[in-house]
């Protein structure tokens, strides 16, 4: 059965050019943490396995950086990186853990950080 | 972009033969890399896979005379004490290991062991 | 130690036909394959990934399905360029094993 639940940044905005902090944290399980993927819809970001480190993919190389920990950072953001984030936490043994996060980027300084909230 | 530098060739079984593999364009800091190899004629035969962190698997066969190391551009697949068997196409790709696949793979070299 | 069985070995097909490739692992492997075309003198190109999500650029007349441990890669509409030969590999697990790959699937078209 899985008990766990991932918090996740939420609902967030950040200014065109600037930089956002993608962050999920997996809670109430004991299941060993096997790998996180960072996808965007459907494309894969990132990835970070327990045993071999952190895997950035090659189209993203150049805007996307490893943590802090789990997370994962998005620079020289750009309009088109609007949309949903999902983190991916595969786990030993419960399975297979989701987190959505919706990036606005705003052409204005107008960029406020949305709530945080749970999904199960 | 994925290339192997190292030409193949010619080795004796007394070599200690090494191969690298250069990654243009970008760091290997955040990217895993495999190596493969394929005998003339035969299928494919994973080696090993070095992480960003620079952990290493290997397979079965490989462990203790097949090394993988790594530099911020370069991979590199040291073979001690070749044999005759290990006659093979070497290939390195980017991921393997749960990156959803491996890609994209440099063109491949061809290592000969004859004594 | 996961083995990857690969059937068959070699398949002919007429071109426009459907050609489907089996791939059985010895333990559940969680949708962790990937499958590649290789054509002679070349490196094997990534075609499909987590079992059945197409990679860039491949076109829509290769698809893969599968769970646990039974897999399937199928071409249909077969032409001409998908002479190659096939390869499963598994992404599960690293540990003990002998080889992440199928020992390959050769399609002729006639």
């Known amino acids: 059965m899985m008990t766990g639940t991932i918090e996740t940044t939420g609902n967030i905005s950040a200014e065109k050019g600037g930089s956002i902090i993608l962050q999920c944290h997996l809670s109430s399980t004991t299941a060993q943490v096997t790998q996180v993927n960072w996808e965007q819809q459907d494309q894969l970001l990132a990835i970070c396995n327990a045993d071999l480190g952190w895997h950035i993919y090659p189209a993203f190389k150049d805007r996307v950086a490893p943590g802090p920990g789990l997370g994962l950072t998005l620079q020289s953001l750009t309009v088109n990186d609007t949309g949903e984030y999902f983190c991916i936490y595969h786990t030993y043994p419960d399975g297979t853990y989701t987190g959505r996060i919706f990036l606005e980027v705003l052409e204005s300084s107008v960029a406020e950080h949305g709530a945080r909230f749970q999904i199960p | 972009q994925v290339q192997l530098e190292s030409e193949g060739g010619l080795f004796k079984p007394t070599d200690t033969l090494t191969l690298t593999c250069t990654v243009s364009g970008s760091s290997l800091s955040s990217s895993y890399m495999s190596w493969v190899r394929q005998a003339p004629g035969k299928g494919l035969e994973w080696i090993g896979i070095i992480g960003s962190n620079g952990n290493t698997y290997y397979a079965n066969w490989a462990k203790g005379r097949f090394t993988i190391s790594k530099t911020s551009t370069t991979v590199e697949l040291k073979i001690t004490s070749p044999t005759t068997e290990d006659t093979a196409t070497y290939f390195c790709?980017?991921?393997?290991?749960?990156?959803?696949?491996?890609?994209?793979w440099g063109p491949g070299t061809l290592v000969t062991v004859s004594s | 130690d996961i083995v990857m069985t690969q059937t068959p070995a070699s398949v002919e097909v007429a071109v426009g036909g459907t050609v489907t490739i089996k791939c059985q692992a010895s333990q559940s492997i969680s949708s962790y394959l990937n499958w590649y075309q290789q054509k002679p003198g070349q490196p094997p190109k990534l075609l499909i990934y987590d079992a059945l999500k197409l990679a860039s650029g491949v076109p829509s007349r290769f698809s893969g399905s599968g769970s646990g441990t039974e897999y399937t890669l199928t071409i249909s509409g077969v032409e001409s360029a998908d002479a190659a030969t096939y390869y499963c590999q598994q992404e599960h697990s690293v540990g003990n094993v002998d080889n992440v790959f199928g020992g390959g699937t050769e399609v002729v078209v006639k």
């Open positions: 790709a980017r991921g393997g290991y749960r990156t959803s696949g491996m890609d994209p």
